[in-house]
Interface confidence: medium
């Protein structure tokens, strides 16, 4: 049994707040029509609401978000040679979070 | 296009490292046979490796982990009254990460 490793500390709730998450920049965000390219970087950090609330009827939701455009490199492969282009991807960062009732519509500013 | 909101900064790669994530403590982790109870807290923070690597043949993987037992409250509902018990859940924290080739076997300490 693994229980003997250390004394069990009381578990602390992961409160509803913004945390750093990894967002994968999929190629479809850059170009839906062509798959013959790479994106750099393949992933970036975003701020997202996570954690849990006091009961199942409420969820951790963003109350304020911000759109953040970032520039990525689109590396097209043409006749086995790389051609470097630039593209813009708009990321969504969560700025503030709140435990909200599941069915409630929420204004996002 | 949203590019006019602000100037697009160059995207920075989300490097392979430990980040704080939220781990859901599901009831089945506590008791397989009985669904007539609640777990508190319903979720906790863990440290997990995330981020991306230079190419698709490598993945961000933990190289060192720690198993951490935590004590949760199992709140049984008996004749509409709550009975408080304790249970232990073993969490896994990642302590160190590395970009490793996908198929490589890896020792974990």
């Amino acid at each position: 049994s693994l229980g003997s490793l250390t004394i069990a500390e009381p578990a602390m709730i992961a409160e509803c707040k913004t945390r750093t998450e990894v967002f994968e920049i999929s190629r479809r965000l850059i170009d839906r029509t062509n798959a013959n390219f790479l994106v750099w970087p393949p992933c970036v950090e975003v701020q997202r609401c996570s954690g849990c609330c006091n009961n199942r009827n409420v969820q951790c939701r963003p109350t304020q978000v911000q759109l953040r455009p970032v520039q990525v490199r689109k590396i097209e492969i043409v006749r086995k040679k790389p051609i470097f282009k630039k593209a813009t991807v708009t990321l969504e960062d969560h700025l503030a979070c709140k435990c909200e009732t599941v069915a409630a519509a929420r204004p996002v500013t | 296009s949203l590019g006019s909101l602000t100037i697009a900064e160059p995207a920075m790669i989300a490097e392979c490292k430990t980040r704080t994530e939220v781990f859901e403590i599901s009831r089945r982790l506590i008791d397989r046979t009985n669904a007539n109870f609640l777990v508190w807290p319903p979720c906790v923070e863990v440290q997990r490796c995330s981020g991306c690597c230079n190419n698709r043949n490598v993945q961000c993987r933990p190289t060192q982990v720690q198993l951490r037992p935590v004590q949760v409250r199992k709140i049984e509902i008996v004749r509409k009254k709550p009975i408080f018990k304790k249970a232990t859940v073993t969490l896994e924290d990642h302590l160190a990460c590395k970009c490793e080739t996908v198929a490589a076997a890896r020792p974990v300490t």
Epitope: - | S26, R28, R61, V65, R106, V108
Partner: antibody
């Protein structure tokens, strides 16, 4: 409803490689340890490997150690088994199974399995 | 490695019979013993865990007992749907090991 669906099996020559996948749904995949168990035709059950919920702790049967690698992608709710240097005795139906918590090395729910045949 | 020995390897019984299957571990495994049922062409199903705890949704005619090295699975009154192969498994230590199985057939 818990669902585990394996894929990637097939016929492979001795010494060859194969990668099995197990797509999970109906439960919080990232909260559970997962395993691979195999069953040779007409034989009993044999544990192959187990991986922790976060992917950092792995364990293997001696018969596959150094040849097989278990991994998972929690963002895709998928479990993998990379099988290298395959041998005739690896021929079996490979099933993924949900293994409960860290102190619980058992198998709550199973997939239907995918057949791996190693033959020249 | 811990060896798990099941007996008998097969048995014939009738509907309504009381059936007992035994499983012996080569060393003490406390109560870390689980029982599974497998029907032909189907995935195994967990019946009993921790030697005597009934898995959710499993009929109460199935029961488990024992600790240390000797364990028993009992079906109090065999039903038509119970004809299958039963496996024990120790979850005390890796490598995890199964018994060889007991096939319960119709008499």
């Amino acid at each position: 409803e818990v669902q585990l669906v394996e894929s990637g099996g097939g016929l492979v020559q001795p010494g060859g490689s194969l990668r099995l996948s197990c797509a999970a749904s109906g439960f919080t995949f990232s909260s559970y340890w997962m395993s691979w168990v195999r069953q040779a035709p007409g034989k009993g059950l044999e544990w192959v490997s187990t991986i922790s919920d976060g992917g950092g702790t792995t364990s293997y049967a001696d018969s596959v150690k150094g040849r097989f690698t278990i991994s998972r992608d929690n963002s895709k709710n998928t479990l993998y088994l990379q099988m290298n240097s395959l041998r005739a005795e690896d021929t079996a139906v490979y099933s993924c199974a949900e293994s409960g918590g860290a102190t619980d090395y058992l198998f709550d729910y199973w997939g239907q399995g995918t057949l791996v045949t190693v033959s020249s | 490695d811990i060896q798990m020995t099941q007996s008998p390897s097969s048995l014939s019984a009738s509907v309504g019979d009381r059936v007992t299957i035994t499983c012996r571990a080569s060393q003490s495994i406390s109560s870390y013993l689980n029982w599974y049922q497998q029907k032909p062409g189907k995935a195994p199903k967990l019946l009993i865990y921790a030697a005597s705890s009934l898995q959710s949704g499993v009929p109460s005619r199935f029961s488990g007992s024992g600790s240390g090295t000797d364990f028993t699975l009992t079906i109090s009154s065999l039903q038509p749907e119970d004809f299958a192969t039963y496996y024990c498994q120790q979850s005390y230590i890796t490598p995890l090991t199964f018994g060889g199985g007991t096939k319960v057939e119709i008499k």
